[in-house]
């Protein structure tokens, strides 16, 4: 057999014995002679150094470039490859040598008591385990212990090659601590020697680098790159960096193994990459790449250095935000700079701090904004190394959404006396104003009697054919009253007022606002009663603790069966397809309340009264009353408001002032506060009594202390009380000049 | 000062007939409303009968409608309570009232001067 390709001027050397293969027995002798046209060595096996004492290389004696190699008494360990070649060239000829030896069928390595072979649990790899043959036929198994497994050639993946040894998948003996080769000769079991079984790994799981992403520093300051891989137990791990400067002076590479915990099926490396001061040259992309052998995984990042430490605003940075009540608001500081900007926000000149409703930082979040939210913020970037400053306003606008103020105050149903002139408001706050409030009207019955898609109890009317109030046909005449701008709770609010001029026909009215958010709406059930008349008495909205009473009257010669309800607070659920139904028509919904029947000549009156009024009594109180010939009934209905107790306060402050001998001072001092308080006035602690120039007006409300005199100096307080205590507000008046003499002097 | 004072009261067989008297002093009847309660053992105060300012409309509670009558002499400044048909039901103490010129006080929290009350029995 030839080895090496064949040179223009030489010829492959020539052996005597022209074979690839030769058999011979043991202990005879073994000898081949090489000729070619230059000087010539011999390679045999076990020995490729040429100073085995049993092999002899003798020159020819007939002739230039020849040489013979001489085993006597060759053994089983004498198999192999015998090679003849050309010093310093790859030209050779092969003869492959099996010196059969049945006591010793194995080849044994010089020396060797035991081998090792290397494996990696991967289902696709194979071992190949070096017992070689004597003899090339041989019937061999490889035995694999503990526990003791027999793995036999199958003709697919386990084989036993007299030239390479015993191949097999290396998982099927990575449990094994070592095996052998067996041969059977004539019921003889010959072994190899043993070969201890070391099981390498060679999964990467991943490489990561540290820091990952958006490193950035300034010329002259330290890189650190850390790079880890985590493999799996019994790997080794070459690391190998790229990096844009590769002549880097002061370049560190420190690669360690790390400790893992005990039991863990992983294992650690770190490669750690430090570069003592940077250069604009060492700017670009780093690529750390960890190999197992059997495989390599990298990650890469880029690495962007500076000139110099700087701040500035991004071209991105808003100067306008708009957004709607509720809505979450995100303004990022958009910033490009080195190091990272330490971030403050102020709100119209006041520094915001992170709450549970707002969280300043990169990005200035509004969880749910509001109105009061809208203003000025200012953000100012501070470079932490140079100490620069930037800022830059943003303003937001909050707009909401029209809002109709009455639409949580009014019941569901409020009864009109036939005949009677009425107003309805819809009072509306938006931001920006509405652009229109327009108002539509229906007839109550045919809303009533549609069959509807869905109702619920927010919007209870199902009816969809709303007509302009402008089309008044077949329903009340109305006039609708030009909108005033009203300055209501500290809000510029918009009131649309519609004037009935005659409450002739049950009716529902619609007031609708727009804005450039969104829309609101308020329906109002225009109930038109001949029926019963509901009054309250002592007043209209009672505060909490008082007693009220609900009078409902009615004509004794038209109504019989008078009885007070009280509506539910939630109506049974209405499901889709069927109807809204009046009050009169659904009692279910009903609460029946105790009360008194009086009677007078032509009316009955049936009185409900509620002591100790709580805001539990507020709802809707409905008087029914049934027509003594018809038996249809007639039903009122009333909202009650209880009014919460509230504390006095006293708004505005007194202030001390200084007055000369003979002007005036008037000063006054607002209370409120449920039940309404009383206002007293004391000088120096005692009550102040009226005189000819001291004059107390509205309900105590405004002091005049008219051509005050010396002894008009004091300290004034005023007090407002009601049974839920007191407030009061003091201020001290100081008179100057000379008191005057008087005519009686 | 403010005072209304009521007298006879006292035992009647049922059936019988008694008239409560009330004098006010301080306070015009002519003016403003007035009204009779009464409070019988364990229960409420409960209004039995109303007379509007000038005595124009006249007020009755349903369980003394046609029996009781409510009247006033504006110029005695006295108001009165002419019990028929008494049941033992009726027995309680009565109260004479003072309210508003409007409405007239047929429940507590509108009444604004009370009387002490005359105790009335009626027995089976």
């Known amino acids: 057999a030839s080895v090496g390709l064949p040179s223009v001027s030489l010829d492959l050397p020539r052996l005597s014995i022209q074979k690839d293969i030769l058999t011979i027995k043991a202990n005879t002798t073994l000898q081949i002679t090489c000729r070619g046209q230059r000087d010539l060595d011999w390679l045999w096996p076990n020995n490729q150094s040429g100073s085995e004492q049993r092999v002899e290389v003798t020159e020819c004696s007939d002739g230039l470039f020849c040489k013979t190699l001489t085993i006597p008494k060759v053994i089983g360990n004498d198999t192999g490859a015998y090679k003849c070649f050309y010093r310093e060239t790859d030209l050779a000829s092969v003869i492959y040598v099996y010196v059969q030896d049945y006591r010793s069928p194995f080849i044994a390595s010089v020396s060797d008591q035991h081998g090792v072979v290397y494996i990696t649990e991967n289902k696709n790899k194979t071992v190949v385990i070096p017992c070689l043959g004597s003899i090339s036929n041989l019937n061999v198994s490889l035995c694999a212990r503990y526990p003791e497994k027999r793995f036999v050639p199958d003709g697919n993946r386990i084989s036993w090659d007299s030239k390479k040894g015993f191949t097999i998948p290396s998982y099927m003996i990575s449990y094994a601590g070592m095996v052998f080769c067996e041969a059977k000769i004539n019921d003889e079991s010959y072994q190899s020697i043993m070969y201890i079984v070391v099981v390498v790994g060679y999964r990467i799981y991943d490489v990561v680098l540290s820091p990952s992403h958006g490193i950035e520093l300034s010329v002259g300051e330290k890189l650190v790159l850390n790079c880890t891989a985590r493999t799996e137990l019994n790997v080794g791990i070459d690391f190998n960096w790229e990096y844009p400067s590769s002549k880097h002076q002061h370049k560190k590479l420190v690669n360690r193994d790390l400790k893992t915990q005990s039991g863990s099926e992983m294992k650690k490396f770190l490669s750690t990459l430090t570069i003592d001061g940077v250069t604009r040259s060492d700017q670009g992309l780093y690529t750390c790449a960890a190999s197992s052998g059997l495989m390599t995984k990298k990650n890469s990042t880029f690495v962007r250095v500076h000139e110099k430490p700087f701040v500035a605003f991004g071209s991105g940075m808003e100067s306008l935000v708009e957004a709607t009540v509720g809505e979450r608001v995100r303004i990022p500081a958009k910033y490009l700079g080195y190091p990272p900007p330490e971030i403050k926000w102020y709100k119209n000149g006041i520094p915001l701090e992170s709450n549970h409703t707002i969280k300043a930082g990169h990005v200035l979040t509004i969880m749910e904004v509001s109105e009061r939210d809208t203003g000025n913020y200012t953000v100012i970037l501070t470079n932490p190394i140079s100490k620069e400053k930037q800022s830059h306003v943003v303003s937001l606008v909050v707009y909401v959404p029209p809002q109709i103020g009455e639409k949580s105050l009014i019941s569901p149903v409020d009864s009109y006396q036939y005949g009677t002139t009425q107003t309805l408001t819809c009072t509306v706050y938006a931001i920006p104003p509405p652009h229109h409030i327009h108002w539509y009207w229906q007839l109550e019955e045919e809303c009533a009697n549609e069959p509807s898609q869905a109702v619920s109890v927010t919007n209870p009317y199902p009816c969809e054919e709303w007509r302009s109030v402008e089309d008044f046909q077949g329903g009340n005449k109305i006039e609708v009253n030009k909108n005033q701008f009203a300055l209501i709770e500290g809000k510029n609010k918009t009131v649309s007022t519609l004037v009935i001029q005659a409450a002739n026909v049950s009716a529902l009215y619609k007031c609708e606002a727009v804005n450039k958010v969104g829309r609101g709406e308020r329906v109002i059930s225009f109930h038109v009663t001949r029926g019963p008349e509901i009054t309250l008495q002592p007043d209209m909205q009672p505060t909490e603790q008082e007693s009220v009473s609900l009078w409902c009257t009615a004509d004794r010669s038209t109504f019989e069966n008078l009885t007070w309800y009280k509506l539910g607070p939630q109506p049974l659920p209405i499901h889709v397809g069927e109807l809204p139904t009046p009050v009169c028509k659904n009692l279910d919904t009903l609460w029946k309340l105790n009360a008194t029947m009086f009677s007078n000549s032509t009316n009955d009156i049936l009185i409900m009264e509620l002591k100790n009024a709580s805001l539990q009594d507020q709802g809707d109180y409905v008087c029914l009353a049934q027509d003594r010939k018809t038996k249809k009934r007639h039903c009122v209905v009333r909202q009650l408001t209880v009014l919460e107790r509230v504390a006095p306060t006293i708004t505005g402050n007194l202030e001390n002032q200084t007055t000369s001998i003979g002007e005036s001072i008037e000063v006054s001092c607002t209370a409120s506060g449920n039940p309404p308080p009383q206002i007293m006035w004391f000088k120096d602690n005692e009550t102040l009594v009226e005189d000819s120039g001291i004059v107390l007006k509205d309900g105590n409300r405004n002091l005049t202390i008219r051509r005050v005199r010396k002894e008009d100096e004091g300290l004034y307080t005023c007090q407002a009380c009601s049974v839920l205590g007191c407030a009061k507000v003091e201020a001290f008046f100081i008179i100057e000049g000379a008191q005057e003499k008087t005519n009686l002097e | 000062q403010v005072q209304l004072q009521e007298s006879g009261g006292g035992s009647v067989q049922a059936g019988g007939s008694l008239t409560l008297s009330c004098e006010v002093s301080?306070?015009?009847?002519?003016?403003?409303?007035m009204g009779w309660f009464r409070q019988a053992p364990g229960k409420e105060r409960e209004g039995v009968a109303g007379?509007?300012?000038?005595?124009?409309?006249?007020y009755y509670a349903n369980f003394v409608q046609g029996r009781f009558t409510i009247s006033q002499d504006n110029a005695k400044n006295m108001v009165y309570l002419q019990m028929n048909s008494l049941k033992p039901e009726d027995t309680a103490i009565y109260y004479c009232a003072a309210g508003a010129p409007d409405p007239p006080p047929l429940i507590e929290s509108i009444v604004k001067y009370w009387g002490q009350g005359t105790q009335v029995t009626v027995s089976s």
């Open positions: 007379i509007n300012e000038g005595g124009v409309s006249t």
């Open positions: 301080g306070y015009s009847v002519n003016s403003n409303s």
